[in-house]
C-alpha cells in the first residue's frame, strides 16, 4: 500500500531512507537537458523474495537534443504524484542497509540523473531525521517517522526531532545529550 | 485510542503551591513530547512549552521561565505542571497535549482557580 | 518571539454559506501553520496541519491554504456544528505561538 502523502516536514531538518520496503518506487527523473530514453521505464521498483531484495528496472537518461522522433516521455499526473523530493545525501546514521530483510538499499547513481530524487513509499517506510547545518536537536529522542495504515488510511507519524537555533538555550536533567538516537521509535502508537 | 487524562479542577489561595498531572495511554509515552496550554478566562490559547518524558529535556516559552516546572514520570506515563507559589494570575484552565510541532492529542484540562 | 494575527476577531455567517478565516504571521513562518476548533466547554481539536494537510477524521468542508506570512482556513459549508472559535498556530520557531482566536457564529 502506497503512502498517500509525502514525509512531514519539520522546521530546520531534513530527512533521509536508510533502506526502502519493497513495493518503494523511484521515478525516473533526468537532469536538466536530458530525458528518459524511448521506452525508458518511468520508475524503479523494489522487489524481492524471503532471502533478497533488489530494484528492479533500469532508470536511463539521454540528451534532450539527440534527433528523436518520439516525444518526450513523462508521467501522467496518475502515475508520478507529487511527492517529496529528497536531495541525494550520505546516511545519516550508521544503519546497515544491508542487513534489513525486505528492503532494498539507496539505488546507485545513474548517468545524467536529476538532483533530487522522488520516491514513493509504502506503508511500514521508515524514514530518519537530521538537523540541518546551524542548528542542534533538543534532545537525543527519536528522529523518525513512520508511514502507518490507521483507520485505513496512510499517515506518517508525528517527528519527535526538534532542530533548535545554537543561541536558543533549553534544560537538560544532566549534560547535554547527543543527537539522534534509533533506540526509540515513535511507531507503537495504538490504532484502532 | 491515544488519550491524555489530566487531573481534577484546583482551588488554591495565592503563595501556595501545586502540581497538576496528566496521564497519557493507547502510545509509546516516553517517545512524545508533551506540552502545556493555558487558556485564562474567556481568552485565547498560550503555549507554556514541552517536556521529553524520555529523558526530561524541558523548553520553556520566554513567558513561563521560572513561573513553573516540567516534569514527567515514564514509569506512570504521567507528565506534571507544577508552581511553586501560586497568584491569582495563574487562575486559567490548563492542557496538556502531545507535540511537539502541531498538537494532535489534547487532555480535557485542568481548571485551576486561585482566590483569597 | 512570532506574532500570529487572526481576523475577523468575530464571524456570523448561515448555514451553508462559505467560511473563511485569515492568519498572518509577523514573519515568514514556511507553512508551519496548523488551525485548531474549540468548542464551547471543550479541549481545541487539530483540524489541520502543515498549512493543509488534514487531521483524521475532520470533515473535509475544512481546508486550508496559504504560504509564508498569510494562510486562510476555510468552511466550505458552514454546519451548525461548526460553531466554535478557530484558532492558527505557527510551529516554526520556538516558542510556538497562537493566533488570538475567530469566533464563529449563525447568523
Known amino acids: 500500500e502506497l503512502c498517500d502523502d509525502d514525509p512531514p516536514e519539520i522546521p530546520h531538518a531534513t530527512f533521509k531512507a536508510m533502506a526502502y520496503k519493497e513495493g518503494t518506487m523511484l521515478n525516473c527523473e533526468c537532469k536538466r537537458g536530458f530525458r528518459r530514453i524511448k521506452s525508458g521505464s518511468l520508475y524503479m521498483l523494489c522487489t524481492g523474495n524471503s532471502s533478497h531484495s533488489s530494484w528492479d528496472n533500469q532508470c536511463q537518461c539521454t540528451s534532450s537534443a539527440t534527433r528523436n522522433t518520439t516525444k518526450q516521455v513523462t508521467p501522467q499526473p496518475e502515475e508520478q504524484k507529487e511527492r517529496k523530493t529528497t536531495e541525494m545525501q550520505s546516511p545519516m546514521q550508521p544503519v546497515d542497509q544491508a542487513s534489513l530483510p525486505g528492503h532494498c538499499r539507496e539505488p546507485p547513481p545513474w548517468e545524467n540523473e536529476a538532483t533530487e530524487r522522488i520516491y514513493h513509499f509504502v506503508v511500514g517506510q521508515m524514514v530518519y531525521y537530521q538537523c540541518v547545518q546551524g542548528y542542534r536537536a533538543l534532545h537525543r529522542g527519536p528522529a523518525e517517522s513512520v508511514c502507518k495504515m490507521t483507520h485505513g488510511k496512510t499517515r506518517w507519524t508525528q517527528p519527535q526531532l526538534i532542530c533548535t537555533g545554537e543561541m536558543e538555550t533549553s534544560q537538560f536533567p544532566g549534560e547535554e545529550k547527543p543527537q539522534a538516537s534509533p533506540e526509540g521509535r515513535p511507531e507503537s502508537e495504538t490504532s484502532c | 485510542e491515544v488519550q491524555l487524562v489530566q487531573s481534577g479542577a484546583e482551588v488554591k489561595k495565592p503563595g501556595e503551591s501545586l502540581k497538576i498531572s496528566c496521564k497519557g495511554s493507547?502510545?509509546?509515552?516516553?517517545?512524545?513530547?508533551i506540552g502545556w496550554v493555558r487558556q485564562m478566562p474567556g481568552k485565547g490559547l498560550e503555549w507554556m512549552g514541552i517536556i521529553s518524558p524520555g529523558d526530561s529535556t524541558t523548553k520553556y516559552s520566554p513567558s513561563f521561565q521560572g513561573q513553573v516546572t516540567f516534569s514527567a514520570d515514564k514509569s506512570t506515563s504521567t507528565a506534571y505542571l507544577q508552581w511553586s507559589s501560586l497568584q491569582a494570575s495563574d487562575t486559567a484552565m490548563y492542557y496538556c497535549?502531545?507535540?511537539?510541532?502541531?498538537?494532535?492529542?489534547w487532555g480535557q484540562g485542568t481548571l485551576v482557580t486561585v482566590s483569597s | 518571539d512570532i506574532q500570529m494575527t487572526q481576523s475577523p476577531s468575530t464571524l456570523s455567517a448561515s448555514v451553508g454559506d462559505r467560511v473563511t478565516i485569515t492568519c498572518r504571521a509577523s514573519?515568514?513562518?514556511?507553512?508551519?501553520l496548523a488551525w485548531y476548533q474549540q468548542k464551547p466547554g471543550k479541549a481545541p481539536k487539530l483540524l489541520i496541519y502543515k498549512t493543509s494537510s488534514l487531521e483524521s477524521g475532520v470533515p473535509s468542508r475544512f481546508s486550508g491554504s496559504g504560504s509564508g506570512t498569510d494562510f486562510t482556513l476555510t468552511i466550505s459549508s458552514l454546519q451548525a456544528e461548526d460553531v466554535a472559535v478557530y484558532y492558527c498556530?505557527?510551529?516554526?520557531?520556538?516558542?510556538?505561538?497562537f493566533g488570538q482566536g475567530t469566533k464563529v457564529e449563525i447568523k
Open positions: 493507547g502510545y509509546s509515552f516516553s517517545n512524545y513530547w
Open positions: 514573519q515568514s513562518v514556511s507553512g508551519y
Open positions: 498556530q505557527q510551529y516554526y520557531s520556538t516558542p510556538w505561538t
Open positions: 497535549v502531545r507535540g511537539p510541532y502541531y498538537l494532535d492529542y
